[in-house]
């Protein structure tokens, strides 16, 4: 088992909004849960966009999940990752 490296980034979207993207890379096996939580609960699926789980050329895999949020409310959002029985949560950078 190779645990993922998880990285959260932000980019400006429309005025007053930002897109936050959570990327997991270099993990094996390919089964992974990657999702955004808002206020500690699941963010609905229709407000998230997922990338495919793709091989990254090193025998491991990569994927991403993104959502659009209001600027100034970053603290309310965390990226949740689960892989091979391990869990971690990742905040949006300031």
């Amino acid at each position: 088992t190779v645990p993922p490296m998880v990285n959260v980034t932000r980019s400006e979207a429309s005025e007053g909004n930002i897109t936050v993207t959570c990327r997991a890379s270099s993990f094996y096996p390919r089964n992974i849960i990657l999702t955004w939580r808002q206020d500690g609960v699941s963010l609905s699926h229709d407000t998230q966009q997922w990338g495919d789980v793709l091989p990254d050329g090193n025998g491991t895999y990569q994927t991403w999940v993104a959502t659009r949020i209001c600027a100034g409310e970053e603290q309310r959002f965390t990226c949740y990752m689960e892989h091979s029985g391990n869990h971690s949560t990742h905040p949006v950078p300031s």
Partner: antibody, heavy 119, light 107 residues
Framework: DVQLQESGPGLVKPSQSLSLTCTVT?????????WNWIRQFPRNKLEWMGY???????NYNPSLKSRISITRDTSKNQFFLQLISVTTEDTATYYC????????????WGQGTLVTVSA | DIQMTQSPASLSASVGETVTITCRAS??????LAWYQQKQGKSPQLLVY???MLADGVPSRFSASGSGTQYSLKINSLQPEDFGSYYC?????????FGAGTKVEIK
Amino acid sequence: DVQLQESGPGLVKPSQSLSLTCTVTGYSITSDYAWNWIRQFPRNKLEWMGYINYSGTTNYNPSLKSRISITRDTSKNQFFLQLISVTTEDTATYYCSYYRYDGAWFPYWGQGTLVTVSA
Amino acid sequence: DIQMTQSPASLSASVGETVTITCRASGNIHNYLAWYQQKQGKSPQLLVYNAIMLADGVPSRFSASGSGTQYSLKINSLQPEDFGSYYCQHFWSFPLTFGAGTKVEIK
């Protein structure tokens, strides 16, 4: 460590309002987290009532939405529960707690305060 | 709302025994589950979060498992301090709801 302490009257008359205070020490309620009220009925059933978060946003249990209000006093690092038009069914031990945004579980609770609704 | 059904409602066990408590959700909660222990006259204390993760300071005789709608809490070699009530709580969506509890008593 975050510490929470509930206070308020132990006896409220039916149709009146129940008002409780949670005093938080060891952490600023404006820094982060969701600050919650949870109650436990005499037969031990637990009910999440709602929260006010670090920015003042509230979220209530729909079963209580028409009767509940959670507010705060940031200068005193306190948050408050008001429940209007109480009945004997609101007799319970009321707890304040908080959760972090990595997941809505409750790592620490206040000691609880028993509120009896009776004429 | 997601309803949480716990079983059994109560059980009697001896020190040293292994006990298992189960919690069933009315919908898939995707491991968004916590377990609490409550002793008489005290506040609930967090035992488990994210379905399987032991909270800080929780002894390793406690373990938790499950997925989808079915979850369980297992206590190996029950100790005197383990007697009390246990509650599950989901945090998949609002409103957050709790199970009705399981009371673990001394046989």
